[in-house]
């Protein structure tokens, strides 16, 4: 029977800069029941606080709700592991909510084949930003990426869409069924997961772009 091994805070993410969650990996338990607590202080403060919510993020997590989340303020946090034989502390993690945003995937992905009479046909892709993101406040710039491939192909074709929420693709193989997905990323932060795939059948008479 030993004191617990050193835990590690390995990940912090925010869906929208308004709340965030951090997760830790326990060290060895020393063969005894072990309690974990996360304490933190904000940059420029000395007062230590305990994690406000150990439940929402699941096991070995701490969730910071709206009233505990400030942008451009560094949070300095550590996890304490304690059993009957002693304690151990993680390294301190310095985290700024601005940089840990990982949005939900974009919504309402719609894909349509357009065949105008006077121009080349194209695939028209449209989507909406994730619900939790409020783009109107100006806090956020979201960038988008599209990927698509014929159903049986191994390789994805990637297109960067910038800030727009619709995109045209001209070069497609006629007669093929395509999978299309979209993801988004804030100006600082992480790419979201890919949206659920939308399927589109390309007509056999779809003319390839020169």
């Amino acid at each position: 029977q030993l004191p617990p091994g050193k835990p590690e805070i390995f990940k912090c993410r925010s869906p929208n800069k308004e709340t965030f969650t951090c997760w830790w990996r326990p060290g060895t338990d020393g063969g005894l029941p072990t309690n974990y607590s996360l304490t933190y202080h904000r940059e420029g403060e000395t007062l230590m606080h305990e994690c406000p919510d150990y439940i929402t993020g699941g096991p070995n997590s701490c969730h910071f709700g709206k009233q505990y989340t400030s942008m451009w303020r560094t949070y300095i946090m550590m996890v304490n592991a304690t059993n009957q034989m002693g304690s151990s502390f993680s390294d301190e993690l310095y985290v700024d909510v601005t940089y840990i945003v990982q949005p939900d995937p974009p919504l309402e992905l719609a894909v349509e084949v357009k065949q105008p009479e006077d121009r080349k046909p194209y695939l028209w892709i449209k989507w909406s930003p994730p619900t939790l993101i409020d783009l109107k406040t100006g806090w956020f710039t979201l960038l988008y990426e599209i990927r698509l491939k014929p159903e049986k192909a191994a390789e994805w074709e990637i297109h960067f869409a910038g800030q727009q929420t619709e995109f045209k693709i001209l070069s497609l193989h006629p007669g093929q069924k395509y999978l299309v997905q979209v993801r988004c990323k804030p100006d600082h932060g992480y790419w979201s997961a890919w949206s659920p795939a939308t399927f589109i059948q390309i007509p056999s008479d779809f003319t390839m772009n020169d």
Partner: antibody, heavy 122, light 112 residues
Framework: EVKLVESGGGLVQPGGSLKLSCAAS????????MFWVRQTPEKSLEWVAY????????YYPDTVKGRFTISRDNAKNTLYLQMSRLKSEDTAMYYC???????????????WGQGTSVTVSS | DVLMTQTPLSLPVSLGDQASISCRSS???????????LEWYLQKPGQSPKLLIY???NRFSGVPDRFSGSGSGTDFTLKISRVEAEDLGVYYC?????????FGSGTKLEIK
């Protein structure tokens, strides 16, 4: 415990090349920006390069731009500095350092390695 | 490039005295996000530099509270309230607000 160990330094002739490595442990390497800083024999410090956590963004001062390339292998937890067309003024102790802050492009160099010495001389 | 000018170059002190080191930047180092990325490092003989202060006034983990940083815009100061033997070495200021990031020339704190 955060640990950074540099290697690859040595004596090289002017115009030559050298590749430095920095092996990182004790933290999730792919979540942190990394830096190279050098210290001349006169003890002045110069920031040499930084690289974003994913490796997509790099930056160099004009003194090394076009000659030095910073890169990283997140699967191997290793940072690199490829130096080419070396000059005598590149003679220095080269340190790798890790940004203090979890993710994000700004912030202090909270952890440093012990350094590896590079001498450029004929 | 932002030039960081440190004074004095050498600072002889008696143990227990207060020490003050100045760092002046050639232009404002307030970043567009409102933060000022001014840092202080201490390099003891034969060692790597170690972070003391970040963002002007925030002490890094484990740094004693006798170290304090202050300033804004272009003028910054590191104060050591009661110098101890372990504080001797070379102190560098650094700005990480504008690329290329730049260090000051260093201030050597030594026993009088």
């Amino acid at each position: 415990e955060v640990k950074l160990v540099e290697s690859g330094g040595g004596l090289v002739q002017p115009g030559g090349s050298l590749k430095l490595s920095c092996a990182a442990s004790g933290f999730t390497f792919s979540d942190y920006y990394m830096f190279w800083v050098r210290q001349t024999p006169e003890k002045s410090l110069e920031w040499v390069a930084y690289i974003s956590n994913g490796g997509g963004s790099t930056y160099y001062p004009d003194t090394v731009k076009g000659r030095f390339t910073i890169s990283r292998d997140n699967a191997k937890n290793t940072l690199y500095l490829q130096m080419s067309r070396l000059k005598s003024e590149d003679t220095a102790m080269y340190y790798c350092s890790r940004q203090l802050f979890y993710y994000g492009s700004r912030g202090a160099m909270g952890y440093w390695g012990q350094g590896t010495s590079v001498t450029v001389s004929s | 490039d932002v030039l960081m000018t440190q004074t004095p170059l050498s600072l002889p002190v008696s143990l227990g005295d207060q020490a003050s080191i100045s760092c002046r930047s050639s232009q404002s180092i307030v970043h567009s996000n409102g933060n000022t990325y001014l840092e202080w490092y201490l390099q003891k003989p034969g060692q790597s530099p170690k972070l003391l202060i970040y963002k002007v006034s925030n002490r890094f983990s484990g740094v004693p509270d006798r170290f304090s940083g202050s300033g804004s815009g272009t003028d910054f100061t590191l104060k050591i309230s009661r110098v101890e033997a372990e504080d001797l070495g070379v102190y560098y200021c650094f700005q990480g607000s504008h690329v290329p990031f730049t260090f000051g020339s260093g201030t050597k704190l030594e026993i009088k």
